[in-house]
Interface confidence: medium
């Protein structure tokens, strides 16, 4: 019997009734067209939903949009189109909402043609009320908020200039012009590219890179013959032009760009990428692109400065710049990134690490399913999961996978079942330990999405036809109850649930047809009567993360220690609540090899934890350049995995000798910066 | 039933040497992490050493860091303590303790008494 | 090191009586705390793991609580066979270190 239909699963008591009784239908007055939805604030309930109508004449297009405005989760909604004065506002700017709980949001209206500058509506009260403010300049870019101060603006405008507002887009100021990028540091600074002789692209390797820390009063030059930048974790990073030729090489600053050393990482040329796919406070997750067009490249992991990399991943599936990869941080268990490969047949499979990079491995054959058509032995096969690159193929596949840190463990995806991600229409599987085992959840292709911290999930079928049902889970996936929500169905187009999956909430987007007009329509459902009470102590149980053997005493023990969580037990019907905080217990290992890197010149032959010399380095002097100065490394083969918390056991010797030469790097040096102001 | 017992203990002069045993039974020893914990005269309790299940690891405490020595036999199910350069605050009895991932000292043995005097 | 501070050092009690004894650590250990019983003679004994898990065997009497820093270990309803020394310890990070004891004495 398909998975939650057998006799064992308990039903959740007069559940169609709880449900009926809250269930909210809203019909929105409005031509089809698209729907874009953002919500305002965290536990607020505020939403807000953008409609926009294109009706093409003969000479232009014309467009109408209309807003509404929700406080209670989406289960009623309210027209507030004229507080933007009936405005048509620009779709592809999206909804600017402000960082953490500002209440600020910002859309950018659409403006005739002969204009001196677009036009922003600003909302700094949950979008009670919006302000119209007339900007002088035409925006190219969706106005980016300072992570630390809501009221800083910036924006990039369609003549290249760098815009930067202080008082929450009242109030805007030009403070550098020819510029191609611009990002938000750490503490209101401001990164960006400049050019110098034509355009962005035309200087693609030629440009600047300035830092501004006071929001345009003063600037410095901390990199030139620049083609990108980039920000990830702690770590600034900038692809810079060789000297001699058309390569490129990543360099990587700690401290904002005053120094920078250049990365352990293979140098690319014209055709090939750099890509960060993870980073944080302790490392980075690198992708090299290999050269050719070969759709894939090496996955490398960094060291605690960003300098020194390890070699982690090879056959990176990883499409041209700017392309697809199935490169996903499991967020609901520490350490675990799942990805796929490109085999030497062309076939894709998915690996999985867990323990940051260290070692990838294949997914464990659920236990329910049978091998499919793509494996050699029927006996012995694994698991492989659909992300971006089978979405961006037009697979069955609606969702990429789905995982949340505040429900431990859980990891929900599309896969196969073979030796290869297989074509044919793929089943969701869910995994209730972070990607070590996995189970059959539901057959055939669906929407899904966690709600109540890991209490409910909710599911729905993907499919052409309209629909009227939605499945819900309180066991993590293991029984399902079905529950009818309209009588008439609705072509399905998104589930919505309040990020950070605390909400009871969710809502279900479609569309009504009818012989002459299509409506937008949303039934947003409450749980809450689903889970009549508050959990208890009894109702949580204590679970071992990365556990693989109970009775072992390193069990458990991932990038140096362990943590014990208290997580929902399965038959526990009750609610976590919009407050409940994951309760972990951390404790510290003894160091083992798997706790170190196989450091520069080094790595790890396949299911070996020593580290062994690279053999085209064998008997070299290992040099690297940091800060750039050479430095001479004398090591047995090991450093410490960034993040790394493990105490005593081995202990592998690492030193580094400074031998004071200049580095043969063409980047800036620290004495030869520049600095301006205005 | 589960059961630890240590052997090795006796009298012995400052700068000797003592070897201290652990016999195991009633569980899966090769699975289990084992730690040495010794109690003074004044029945002050200190962690000592803990070594591995497998035994590649180990851990001291910076009081005896460089004199003892954790090792284990697993086909033995035995666990041991070598000490070396004994002074007179080593004087304790010795136990020895089963730690699992969950919890960390589960199962003591009786105690061995070291006393280092002159 | 972590330094696990227990109060009392001893006290003294009758058959019934409510009994609670405490240790502070000097940093937070999260709930990476044990307490231990010791009676003369006889084999330490595991009474609780995790700051508040009772250990299969052990009466529902004994319970801890605690997160952090400050953990307590209590005796609902003191019997006779409860009469010994109890020790915590803390097991968050090397070295492993213990409380100083208490010992609970007939009144």
């Known amino acids: 019997s398909a998975p939650g239909e057998d006799e064992e699963c308990g039903r959740v008591r007069d559940f169609v009734a709880k449900l009926a009784n809250n269930t909210h239908q809203h019909v929105f007055d409005d031509l089809r067209g698209s729907v874009s939805l953002s919500w305002v604030g965290d536990s607020t309930g505020v939403i807000l939903v953008l409609t926009t109508f294109h009706v093409p004449l003969v000479i232009m297009t014309f467009g109408q949009s209309k807003l509404y405005r929700s406080e209670d989760y989406g289960k009623n909604f309210k027209d507030i189109t004229d507080l933007i004065n009936n405005t048509f506002i620009r779709t592809e700017f999206g909804m600017a909402i402000g960082p953490e709980n500002s209440g600020k949001v910002v859309l950018t209206a659409e403006v005739s043609g002969g204009s001196r500058g677009g036009r922003i509506f600003r909302s700094s009260d949950f979008a009670k009320n919006f302000v119209q403010t007339d900007l002088p300049f035409h925006p190219l870019t969706q106005m980016m908020y300072s992570p630390q101060n809501s009221d800083y603006l910036l924006a990039l405008s369609t003549e290249n200039g760098l815009w930067v507002s202080k008082n929450f887009g009242g109030k805007w100021e030009e403070i550098h012009k020819a510029v191609c990028l611009a990002k938000w540091g750490s503490d209101n600074t401001i990164f960006f590219t400049t050019y110098a002789n034509g355009s962005c692209k035309a200087d693609l390797g030629a440009l600047e890179l300035w830092r501004t820390s006071d929001l345009g009063k003063s600037f410095k030059t901390i990199g030139v013959k620049i083609y990108s930048f980039g920000l990830g974790g702690r770590f600034l990073f900038a692809s810079v032009m060789a000297d001699k030729d058309t390569t490129r090489r990543i360099h990587v600053s700690t401290d904002q760009g005053d120094t920078w050393s250049m990365a352990q990482l293979p140098s690319v040329g014209q055709e090939q990428f750099y890509s960060i796919l993870a980073a944080n406070d302790d490392m980075v997750f690198m992708h090299v692109d290999e050269p050719g067009d070969t759709g894939f490249g090496t996955i490398f992991t960094s060291d605690d400065r960003g300098i020194v990399y390890s070699k982690s991943l090879d056959r990176h599936l990883y499409t041209t710049t700017g392309g697809e990869t199935d490169f996903t941080n499991v967020t609901s268990l520490r350490g675990v990134y799942i990805t796929s490969v490109l085999s030497e047949d062309n076939s894709i499979q998915t690996m999985i690490t867990f323990d940051q990079g260290g070692r990838w491995t294949h997914l464990r054959k659920p236990e329910n399913s049978e091998c499919d058509a793509t494996a050699k032995n029927k006996n012995e096969c694994s698991l492989h999961i659909h992300a971006s690159y089978s979405i961006s193929q037009k697979l069955n596949v609606p969702m990429a996978p789905l995982s949340e840190p505040n429900a431990v463990g859980i990891v929900i995806a599309h896969g196969s079942v073979g030796d290869a991600i297989s074509v044919m229409v793929p089943d969701v599987y869910i995994s209730d330990d972070g990607g070590y085992s996995w189970t059959k959840m539901l057959e055939g292709p669906h929407y899904y999405t966690i709600l109540d911290s890991g209490g409910i999930i909710v599911a729905i079928e993907h499919s052409s036809r309209p629909i009227n049902v939605i499945k819900f889970s309180t066991d993590e996936g293991q029984c399902w109850q079905t529950y009818t929500f309209t009588r008439d169905p609705i072509y399905f187009t998104g589930l919505a649930s309040e990020p950070g999956a605390r909400s009871m909430n969710i809502s279900i987007w479609g569309f009504t047809e009818s012989f002459l007009t299509s409506q937008w329509v949303s039934y947003t459902i409450d749980f809450k009567d689903i889970l009549e009470r508050n959990c208890e102590e009894k109702d949580y149980t204590i679970w071992l993360a990365h556990s693989t053997d109970p009775e072992d005493y390193e069990d458990g023990c991932i990038l140096g220690y362990k943590e014990q969580f208290l997580r929902l037990r399965k038959s526990s019907v009750c609610q976590n609540g919009r407050d409940y905080v994951v309760t972990k217990q951390p404790s510290i290992c003894l160091c083992s090899l798997e706790d170190f890197l196989c450091d520069f010149g080094y790595y790890r032959p396949e299911n070996d934890s020593k580290c062994v010399e690279q053999p085209e380095l064998k008997g070299h002097d290992l040099e690297f350049c940091l800060y750039g100065r050479e430095e001479h490394l004398t090591t047995n083969g090991y450093r410490k995995i960034p993040g790394d918390k493990c105490q005593g056991g081995v202990n592998p010797v690492r030193e580094v000798k400074d031998l004071k030469k200049k580095c043969t790097s063409n980047f800036l040096s620290p004495e030869k910066q520049n600095s301006k102001s205005n | 039933e589960v059961q630890l017992v240590e052997s090795g203990g006796g009298l012995v002069q400052p700068g000797g040497s003592l070897r201290l045993s652990c016999a195991a039974s009633?569980?899966?020893?090769?699975?289990?992490?084992m730690s040495w914990v010794r109690q003074a005269p004044d029945k002050r309790l200190e962690w000592v050493a803990i070594i591995s299940s497998g035994g590649s690891y180990t851990y001291y405490s910076d009081t005896v860091k460089g004199r003892f020595t954790i090792s284990r036999d697993n086909s033995k199910n035995s666990l041991y303590l070598q000490m070396n350069s004994l002074k007179a605050e080593d004087t304790a009895v010795y136990y020895c303790s089963r730690s699992s991932s969950h919890w960390y000292f589960d199962v003591w043995g009786q105690g061995t008494l070291v006393t280092v005097s002159s | 090191d972590i330094q696990m501070t227990q109060s009392p050092s001893s006290l003294s009690a009758s058959v019934g009586d409510r009994v609670t004894i405490t240790c502070h650590a000097s940093q937070g250990i999260s709930s990476n705390i044990g307490w231990l019983q010791q009676k003369p003679g006889k084999a330490f004994k595991g009474l609780i793991y995790h700051g508040t898990n009772l250990k299969d065997g052990v009466p529902s009497r004994f319970s801890g609580s605690g997160s952090g820093a400050d953990f307590t270990l209590t005796i609902s309803s003191l019997q006779p066979e409860d009469f010994a020394t109890y020790f915590c310890v803390q097991y968050a990070q090397f070295p492993y270190t213990f409380g100083g004891g208490t010992k609970v004495e007939i009144r």
């Open positions: 009633g569980f899966t020893f090769s699975t289990y992490g």
